[in-house]
């Protein structure tokens, strides 16, 4: 019977008794930088080259004893999760390993960024097909780690990683924080995130999804024949990397950014239960977990986007946070977030020649997030337009007047502390969807762009009670773009997208009573594009 | 996921024209920053990864490490360069007291130097 | 799904032997430490003896130890449990049963956490007497 | 060796009752801890396993508790189904122990 970690990564037109999807990515060479290996095992012989790295820490203890099986453990069971006869994601990729973890799976920054530049190398001397590495290993946060994986992400090599069995945040590790990899937790065959002794999982922004992590059977070094089951966020990175693999192999010529945003696309949502994470880092933590696409090809129709949340800004009167997307992204809205709800609003702002998305704190505020919603959207030609606060008791208003550009979100930014204190709402007038409007001492920005087909719609929800929680989707074949709240209501928290949803939180209202401002209008902006799925339909 | 400028402990070391003369301080106006592990049982001090400024030539970065070695053994410090990073970041990987870290944040090229730490399996 | 049958139960007089076997399905047979589990007529649960993954480990309840051994076979998909110098006492419906549990790493520490015995098998019945 | 005592040896209690049944360690095991159901002529069923983990299929009625010495079962709302005789085993090594059983009847 198929394991349970490779039935909840199997859309269900693959499953059957033996699971063997379409292409078990051949093309695709994965790195793995771990502990030794026992490359006769009958799971992965012949489908691993243990390359000549290694670069290892000496065992800690005078009593330590090498046993080669257990100096190869780690090693030997993620190289059968990725690619195992068995027991493997991606049954078709070869592997390259490289030793950078000791017989106690302990290394060092620097061992692992010598590996990370062989790679490199190796790729410079004899390009092949696309690469994947896989880091199954945390350490503290490390600048220059992140920096040597944004580096090596840069030249086309996609890198997996553990996000870390801390039960902690996974900004505090490297390389988890680094913004280029591709960091996954551990889940359950119950969804659950995954517990190992008394920590688990780590979670938070710096995690792209989760995968199966928690009793995977594969390769044990006991012997050639043998298999064990082992758990954390290893095995869950490795399910991943045997994912990029499978649709790398469908699809060569994917980039980094594209591959991302089809494994978030593809993941199963909303499945995990939250409770577990830390109340502050339940809204931070991407509730998906992995899947193989339903099909090799025909996803490039769609247009995918993420949301990038930032870093907390921190309580200071003036502080600021900013939410980036990744450089083949384009920025098409900007939100924010305050859990004490003091905040001042939020601004698309060029940073480096890019879009950035920058949130500001108000004063006696505990702090506040910028979210980036950060899309793939081929020949796009974005641009913020801004309208300075009117004087008008109607509100700010500013639309995308350029010929050919549609808008794709709104933000409002305000100098004042307490905006709309005891201020009716302004309502935005029906009949003109390429028009952000604000209170009159906000400044409103308006993300216009214009790509080949793009085509976006407001969709609106409100609802005339006090409510924590507000939310608007776009419908199948739209996706969600801009996330936004109605100006008026002063107890809003801010507004942020979960895949295709615009969430609108505002404060418990238990504590701020049914007044004339309860009223909370969510808003969503919804595009396709029809140039895209054309491409697509020609395609096949 | 995590900003450059992140959680992370960071010491930034103040550079003060010494004995070793203006003309091998870095370009005026940046200061080269050491940062080190905040979880303390991970720290591994005493070998330090020194980065150079991203288009730092592999031949300037030896010349830097031979120059950290000239300086320090002047006042009495051994030390041995592990790696010379090319390929990915310009840099070198140094076993060295801790002593001489404000001598090599002053180095010409330098962008920052990280004391090295343990990374686990997971 | 994950199948245990026993066989090899019987009659046996004190002083024989006896030879159990348990036949698994799947891959998931050897990925994890397996146990004998007996329970005399009327009476509770008791823990015999288990084995790990590749048969390197074992461990015994002290009333069998020196008598019964405990053995798998990964090729086989199979669990022995060979019964010597059978006394009364060793009367009982015997199960055989999967040990699930996980090894993980955490801050250099290889560690194994325990489940408990998630498939049985339906038992088979050993009787000694004269 | 770890001794498992279980309390009460016999309980009788109603359909729709809340039912609790208590074992104690002869020293801690930390959470190391397992309960099974029994039905007549039938192998154990895993119920919860660490203290308080609910094996994946159980009914959501099934909890546990406990840490150290003293460890519980609670049924919140009995149904027809869960008469049967009750199990803790201890997995502190990999030696282990289970108690003597409770036995819930039908009052």
């Known amino acids: 019977s198929i394991p349970w970690n490779l039935e909840r990564i199997t859309p269900p037109r693959y499953r059957a008794d033996e699971y063997q999807p379409p292409d078990g990515g051949s093309l695709v060479e994965v790195y793995l930088l771990d502990t030794s290996i026992q490359s006769d095992h009958r799971e992965i012989e012949g489908r691993v080259m243990v390359t000549d790295f290694e670069n290892v820490p000496e065992e800690d203890g005078t009593r330590f004893h090498r046993q080669a099986s257990k100096c190869d453990s780690h090693g030997t069971h993620l190289a059968g999760v990725v690619s195992g006869r068995d027991a493997g994601v991606a049954k078709g990729a070869s592997m390259r390993s490289l030793r950078v973890l000791n017989c106690q799976g302990k290394g060092t920054v620097s061992g692992t960024l010598i590996g990370l530049e062989f790679i490199r190398k190796s790729q410079l001397v004899q390009p092949v097909g696309p690469l994947v590495v896989l880091l199954p290993l945390a350490g503290g946060y490390s600048r220059v780690l992140n920096a040597a994986c944004q580096r090596l992400a840069r030249a086309g090599v996609v890198l997996v990683t553990a996000a870390g069995n801390f039960r902690d945040d996974a900004c505090l590790y490297s390389p988890a924080s680094a913004p280029e990899v591709i960091t996954v937790g551990a889940t359950n065959a119950q969804d659950q995130p995954v517990t190992l002794g008394t920590l688990g999982t780590n979670f938070g922004r710096c995690v792209d999804l989760f995968a199966p992590g928690e009793d995977i059977i594969g390769a044990s070094s006991d012997c050639s024949t043998c298999f064990v089951s082992q758990s954390g966020t290893s095995q869950a990175a490795a399910h991943v990397a045997g994912i990029a693999a499978m649709m790398l192999s469908a699809e060569p010529e994917l980039t980094l950014a594209e591959l991302r945003q089809r494994l978030i696309h593809f993941s199963a949502k909303d499945v995990i239960n939250e409770a577990w994470f830390p109340e502050d880092q339940r809204v931070l933590t991407p509730n998906l977990v992995a899947a193989l696409p339903p099909s090799t090809h025909g996803a490039g129709w769609q247009l995918f986007c993420r949301t990038v949340w930032s870093a907390h800004s921190g309580p200071t009167r003036m502080a600021t946070a900013v939410a980036r997307c990744a450089p083949d992204e384009e920025l098409l809205s900007c939100s924010s977030f305050s859990r004490s709800g003091k905040r001042r609003g939020e601004r698309m702002e060029a940073q480096g020649g890019k879009l950035v998305c920058r949130a500001h704190n108000a004063f006696g505020g505990e702090g506040v997030y910028a979210i980036a919603r950060c899309c793939l959207l081929p020949q796009a030609n974005c641009s913020v337009h801004t309208a300075p606060p009117a004087e008008a008791s109607m509100g700010t208003r500013v639309h995308c007047h350029q010929q050919g550009h549609v808008l794709t979100g709104c933000s409002s930014h305000w100098e004042v502390e307490d905006l709309g204190t005891h201020k009716p709402p302004v309502l935005r007038p029906r009949g003109q969807p390429n028009q952000c409007v604000g209170h009159r001492e906000a400044s409103i920005h308006a993300s216009c762009c214009h790509a080949p087909g793009l085509e976006c719609k407001v969709k609106e929800h409100g609802i005339p009670a006090p409510q924590e929680q507000v939310t608007v989707a776009c419908e199948e074949g739209w996706t969600l773009t801009g996330c936004s709240a109605l100006p008026g209501t002063s107890h809003v928290l801010g507004a942020y997208a979960v895949d295709n949803t615009c969430v609108v939180r505002s404060r418990d209202v238990s504590t701020t009573g049914s007044t004339s401002e309860g009223a909370v209008t969510a808003v969503a902006i919804c595009c396709r594009s029809r140039h895209l799925a054309q491409a697509s339909q020609e395609l096949q | 996921q995590e900003d450059e400028d992140g959680d992370y402990e960071e010491l930034v070391l103040a550079l003060r024209s010494e004995e070793d003369g203006l003309a091998e301080a870095p370009e005026h106006g940046t200061t080269a920053t050491f940062h080190r592990c905040a979880k303390d049982p991970w720290r591994l001090p005493g070998t330090y990864v020194v980065v150079l400024k991203e288009e730092t030539h592999l031949s300037q970065s030896e010349r830097t490490a031979r120059r950290l070695q000239a300086q320090a053994a002047r006042r009495g410090y051994l030390t041995k360069i592990l790696h010379v990073f090319h390929g990915l970041l310009p840099g070198f990987l140094v076993k060295m007291s801790g002593d001489l870290l404000e001598l090599a944040l002053k180095l010409p090229h330098v962008d920052y130097i990280e004391e090295d730490s343990s990374v686990f399996a997971q | 799904e994950v199948q245990l049958v026993e066989s090899g139960g019987g009659l046996v007089q004190p002083g024989g032997s006896l030879r159990l076997s348990c036949a698994a399905s799947?891959?998931?047979?050897?990925?994890?430490?397996m146990s004998w589990v007996r329970q005399a007529p009327g009476k509770g649960l008791e823990w015999v003896a288990n084995i790990k993954q590749d048969g390197s480990e074992k461990y015994y309840v002290d009333s069998v130890k020196g008598r019964f051994t405990i053995s798998r076979d990964i090729a086989k998909n199979s669990l022995y449990l060979q019964m010597n110098s059978l006394r009364a006492e060793d009367t009982a419906v015997y199960y055989c049963a999967r040990d699930r549990g996980t090894y993980y790493y955490q801050d250099g520490n290889y560690n194994y956490y325990y489940y408990g015995m998630d498939v049985w098998g339906q038992g088979t019945t050993v009787t000694v007497s004269s | 060796d770890i001794q498992m005592t279980q309390s009460p040896s016999t309980l009788s209690a109603s359909v729709g009752d809340r039912v609790t049944i208590t074992c104690r360690a002869s020293?801690?095991?930390?959470?190391?801890l397992a309960w099974y159901q029994q039905k007549p002529g039938k192998a154990p069923k895993l119920l919860i396993y660490?203290?308080?983990s609910l094996e994946s299929g159980v009914p959501s009625r099934f909890s546990g508790s406990g840490s150290g010495t003293e460890f519980t079962l609670t049924i919140s709302s009995l149904q027809p189904d869960d008469f049967a005789t009750y199990y803790c085993?201890?997995?502190?090594?990999?030696?282990?122990?289970f108690g003597q059983g409770t036995k819930l009847e039908i009052k």
């Open positions: 799947g891959i998931t047979f050897s990925s994890y430490w």
């Open positions: 660490k203290a308080s």
């Open positions: 085993q201890q997995y502190n090594s990999y030696s282990y122990t």
């Open positions: 020293q801690s095991i930390s959470s190391w």
